[in-house]
């Protein structure tokens, strides 16, 4: 009962975690304009993996996507690199988690097929939080790094009259829910892998038997061995809705007439 | 075709105040910021601050906190801009105008009021 | 603030001619993300409120002659009539609508001869 249950919330609390990876992905705010020192903004920046966007104080947004592949920072394609190899193991994953489910029957399915399994859902949840961890990680430390950069040249002065304001960003919502989301993946995983040993089924144990040979006698004692349970990481593989993953920032993006103005 | 009726004028005291009324019609009144522009005889426009009628979410110019108050009546389509403490500094065309859609300029805008600070 | 500075402060041209005139802001009005200049311009005809002409420095509001063009970007913009007409006898300003608060030129008067 107690390996159904760690089973069962490992493949829930995964699915919320690939859920959030896959919003995090598509959201828009990775990274936001910083209103420190100007909390109130007639015009302001954010960005994401896939476009950037500008809202204005108008309510009108305007997206455009980045519609280049080579001119794209490498650490960029790096996060979206990321990102997506865990979005595509823990959505494998949880493919492979609903099969090793202990409550879900699928012909003469035995114990040991469903422990391998689970160990492999578990190490595919836990590889694919560890990818979105990393994934937003790297940003958050370009972010950082860009930010004091910025910071450093905030004013350019031109022809010591006029003032070129650089616009510095921040971590923008995207990042926490990829950190959230990362973990609650890892910690799906890591529930699976704990449910697999409890799948796992007991060998017989045999009695020892003592082999005489001639000259010195030595005793073989086979047996007392578990199972192996084979490797396989509990991925919970998350399933996508249409239009599920999709947040209200994204919503946001697309103006309509009756956007405040 | 939007149309912002304001009053022609008003006349009034020194430290009286005034309430300046704007009339939205043939829009969507709540789905628009108003702002509201000052104008000296003579003179160039100064921005007072605006007011989102949907929520009463309002932004000043530093420049006239204290001084104008900016209100609407969502049951009327009115948007209202009270002055207080009047002065002859006052006196000026006041206009308010409909934020554009697209951007962050004013699209349309009343005729404005001329409002004549005299004892 | 940001400072909008406007020149001439007035200046005389026959009908037909080719006018240009200029505004000069104390910060960057072109915005990073979008690439687009949030300057707008407006033309005050006498005994009238302003009508915007030109919106993110260049882009021309619909109904507004294909005579008047924006033009400039970052600090420096200027508005161009191709041909002046009897009835462009306005103050031309320039607005900032990149920050708060919007500000806007002393503006240019036009007068035909």
């Known amino acids: 009962m107690a390996v159904t249950a760690c089973q069962g919330l490992g493949f829930v609390v995964s699915l919320i975690g690939i859920a959030g990876i896959i919003a995090a992905t598509c959201m828009d705010q990775w990274s936001t304009q910083d209103l420190y020192n100007n909390p109130v903004t007639a015009v302001f920046n954010y960005q994401g993996l896939w476009r950037s966007c500008v809202r204005e104080s108008s309510g009108f947004t305007e997206c455009r996507g980045y519609f280049t592949l080579l001119g794209l920072p490498a650490m960029l394609q790096a996060v979206r690199a990321l990102m997506i190899v865990g979005i595509v193991l823990g959505a494998i994953g949880l493919l492979v988690s609903i099969f090793a489910l202990k409550c879900i029957r699928i012909g003469s399915m035995e114990d040991s097929a469903k422990a391998n399994m689970t160990l492999t859902s578990g190490i595919m949840f836990i590889v694919s939080g560890l990818c979105a961890i990393a994934g937003v990680s790297v940003f958050a430390n370009m972010l950082v790094t860009n930010f004091w950069m910025s910071t450093a040249n905030m004013y350019t002065g031109m022809g010591g009259m006029v003032q070129t304001v650089q616009t510095r960003y921040t971590f923008g919502a995207a990042l926490f829910v990829g950190w959230v989301a990362g973990g609650l993946t890892l910690i799906g995983g890591v529930m699976m892998c704990i449910a697999c040993r409890g799948l796992a089924p007991e060998e017989t144990n045999y009695k020892a038997v003592s082999y005489h040979a001639s000259g010195h006698s030595v005793a073989y004692k086979p047996g007392g061995f578990k199972a192996s349970t084979g490797f396989g990481s509990n991925t919970k593989n998350k399933k996508i809705y249409d239009g599920g993953a999709r947040t209200e920032d994204e919503v946001q993006s697309y103006p309509s007439k009756h956007d405040y103005v | 075709q939007v149309l912002l009726q304001q009053p022609g004028t008003e006349l009034v005291k020194p430290g009286a105040s005034v309430k300046v009324s704007c009339k939205a019609s043939?829009?969507?009144?709540?789905?628009?910021?108003i702002h509201w522009v000052k104008q000296r005889p003579g003179q160039g426009l100064e921005w007072i601050g605006r007011?989102?009628?949907?929520?009463?979410?309002?932004t000043y110019n530093q420049n006239f906190k204290g001084k104008a108050t900016l209100t609407v009546d969502k049951s009327s389509d009115t948007a209202y801009m009270q002055l207080t403490s009047l002065t002859s500094e006052d006196s000026a065309v006041y206009y308010c105008?409909?934020?554009?859609?697209?951007?962050?300029?004013?699209?349309?805008w009343g005729q404005g009021s001329l409002v004549t600070v005299s004892a | 603030d940001i400072v909008m500075t406007q020149s001439p402060s007035s200046l005389t041209v026959t009908a037909r001619e080719k006018v240009t005139m200029n505004c000069k802001s104390s910060q960057s009005l072109l915005n990073s993300g979008n690439q687009k200049n949030y300057l707008t311009w407006y033309q005050q005809k006498p005994g009238q409120p302003p009508k915007m002409l030109i919106y993110w420095a260049s882009t021309r509001e619909s109904g507004v002659p294909d005579r008047f063009t924006g033009s400039g970007s970052g600090t420096y913009f200027t508005l161009t009539i191709s041909s002046v007409q009897a009835e462009d006898l306005a103050v031309y300003y320039c607005?900032?609508?990149?920050?708060?608060?919007?500000?806007f030129g002393s503006g240019t008067k036009l007068e035909i001869k």
């Open positions: 043939a829009y969507t009144f709540t789905s628009y910021w």
């Open positions: 007011i989102r009628p949907s929520d009463s979410d309002s």
């Open positions: 607005q900032n609508d990149y920050s708060f608060p919007f500000t």
């Open positions: 105008s409909m934020g554009a859609y697209y951007s962050n300029s004013f699209g349309y």
